[in-house]
Interface confidence: medium
């Protein structure tokens, strides 16, 4: 706001006022009269740039007159009082109310004094973020979706991710006239490494005190990725039983584990217990390749592991494997 004058009257008002769609807003406007100087205010007038006539007038003796009486009201101006406060309240803000307004004091003998105020009509958007569940497509696809609905002006959406990828943002008219819905997709090539990781959608809007952060946990459906653990190449005869574990990562979760060997069914010393294969002690050397076949809703994948049980004393009496 301008600094107080030393010898002249000054109309004080903010250069810009924000208001929310459907709400009411006050356009502040004050006359500052320095020192002992006297002024006669005969009229307060509000007009809109580009429109002929006044939208609100307050005469010193006739009181207020409004172009839209149900939507406008002088906040402080009253008959029989010094007209120093021309602040105007607007009700039921509409998109078309946005624009430049002039607050004018007709004073004597100083003359007319006015100031311009820019009214910004805002609409606070509603923000949502959701995962876009995908399979291994081998090409870039949307994995997360962030939507800012009914903002004015349009919200600004950015993404934060350690996974790579790129945004694809579009705009469409909102439900209320003059508002905008912004949709942003986070696009990348799906991989099993992406599944369960998160990306963050950041929505910025001038109606927010601070940006809104929405985290999305990604979902990538993929068939099992299988490996077998539990064998350390040092299994010997006469040791205790040992265990092989079929390690499977998949989404959705595995529905079944099937153990076999390259020769066919499991030998008597190998007992399948779901994802684990129990290897009982053997009395003669063996050289067997075990197969673990894991199934989920997207398919089956398998892993092989060759196990040798050798002669010779174990280094430790604890078992065929170090477990």
């Amino acid at each position: 706001w301008p600094p107080p004058g030393t010898g002249d009257i000054i109309v004080q008002a903010p250069t810009q006022v924000p208001g929310f769609l459907g709400d009411s807003v006050t356009l502040p406007c004050y006359l500052q009269v320095p020192g002992m100087e006297e002024t006669h205010v005969s009229q307060l007038t509000w007009s809109r740039h580009g429109e002929s006539g006044s939208m609100a007038v307050f005469h010193q003796t006739q009181g207020p007159n409004y172009s839209e009486p149900k939507r406008l009201e002088f906040v402080a101006a009253r008959l029989g009082t010094e007209l120093r406060d021309a602040s105007l309240r607007m009700f039921g803000l509409r998109v078309e109310d946005e624009g430049n307004y002039t607050c004018l004091f007709v004073t004597f003998p100083q003359g007319s004094r006015s100031v311009d105020i820019w009214l910004r009509v805002l609409a606070k958007p509603q923000n949502t973020a959701e995962v876009q569940k995908v399979q291994l497509t081998g090409k870039p696809v949307p994995v997360a979706r962030c939507v800012s609905t009914g903002g004015r002006p349009p919200a600004h959406i950015t993404w934060h991710s350690d996974l790579g990828g790129m945004p694809n943002t579009s705009q469409a008219p909102g439900f209320l006239s003059g508002t905008v819905t912004v949709t942003s997709l986070w696009i990348l090539v799906p991989s099993s490494q992406v599944d369960g990781k998160s990306v963050t959608c950041k929505v910025e809007h001038e109606s927010f005190e601070k940006p809104q952060l929405l985290t999305v946990n990604l979902t990538v459906y993929y068939p099992p990725e299988v490996s077998i653990s539990g064998y350390d190449n040092n299994w010997y005869l006469s040791q205790n039983e040992a265990t092989l574990t079929c390690d499977a990562r998949s989404n959705p979760e595995p529905t079944g584990y099937n153990w076999s060997t390259t020769m066919g069914p499991l030998p008597p010393f190998a007992v399948a217990q779901g994802a684990q294969l129990l290897i009982r002690p053997v009395d003669k050397p063996i050289n067997t390749t075990f197969i673990c076949n894991v199934t989920n809703a997207l398919g089956a994948r398998q892993a092989e592991l060759t196990v040798q049980v050798k002669e010779g004393p174990p280094s430790e009496p604890s078992g065929m494997s170090s477990n």
Partner: antibody, heavy 121, light 110 residues
């Protein structure tokens, strides 16, 4: 064309009253400040009062409070000044003047030709 | 009531610059006095020249300018013309009323 057409000369007796008129045209009367001024022959000007035509709001030089009364009729865009209890001291030319605004200040913009009032028995 | 004093008469020549002043009995003239300057020519033809100390009225030649000089209001005519010969009145605003000066008779000698 902007005009301030004042009523004709008046010859009145002491103690009487007189009502001077100032019919305006060519501008928005209702948003005008109009002052009345007095000038005695060969002398300076004296400000009597102003009126804001839109509201009828007035402000008087204290010297003329009770002596002069200024009014307006917006329907005819006419300003009036009634002078009462006239004395020979009130003999003068009376001007109505519309104030114009430069935006930053008012000036004495449009002058009537003046009405000569002579107070004599 | 305040008294406003002007030079009773000044003489200048065409093309010269002349300054008319306006003093207040209450002290220094300030912008809060919103000095006005009015020209009167024969047959009571009045023209408002300046309002609000230094704001020239529309249509008034640029050679007329208003200002504050020291503690007085001033009307300066830069490059006076013969048609500028007239009586010039200043008027000062005192919170709620105007007070006119006695007027300055300006003669422009050929």
């Amino acid at each position: 064309q902007v005009q301030m057409q004042q009523s004709g000369a008046e010859l009145v007796k002491p103690g009487a009253s007189v009502k001077l008129s100032c019919k305006t045209s060519g501008f928005t009367f209702s948003s005008s400040y109009i002052s009345w001024l007095k000038q005695k022959p060969g002398q300076s000007l004296e400000w009597i009062a102003w009126i804001y035509a839109g509201t009828g709001d007035t402000n008087y030089n204290q010297k003329f409070t009770g002596k002069a009364q200024v009014t307006v009729d917006t329907s005819s865009s006419t300003a009036y000044m009634q002078f009462s209890s006239l004395t020979t001291e009130d003999s003068a030319i009376y001007y109505c003047v519309r104030h114009g605004s430069t935006g930053r200040g008012w000036y004495f913009a449009v002058w009537g030709a003046g009405t000569t009032v002579t107070v004599s028995s | 009531q305040a008294v406003v004093t002007q030079e009773s008469a000044l003489t200048t020549s065409p093309g010269e610059t002349v300054t008319l002043t306006c003093r207040s009995s209450t002290g220094a003239v300030t912008t809060s006095n919103y000095a006005n300057w009015v020209q009167e020519k024969p047959d009571h033809l009045f023209t408002g020249l300046i309002g609000g100390t230094n704001n020239r009225a529309p249509g008034v030649p640029a050679r007329f300018s208003g200002s504050l000089i020291g503690d007085k209001a001033a009307l300066t005519i830069t490059g006076a013309q013969t048609e500028d010969e007239a009586i010039y009145f200043c008027a000062l605003w005192y919170s709620n009323h105007f007070v006119f000066g006695g007027g300055t008779k300006l003669t422009v000698l050929q």
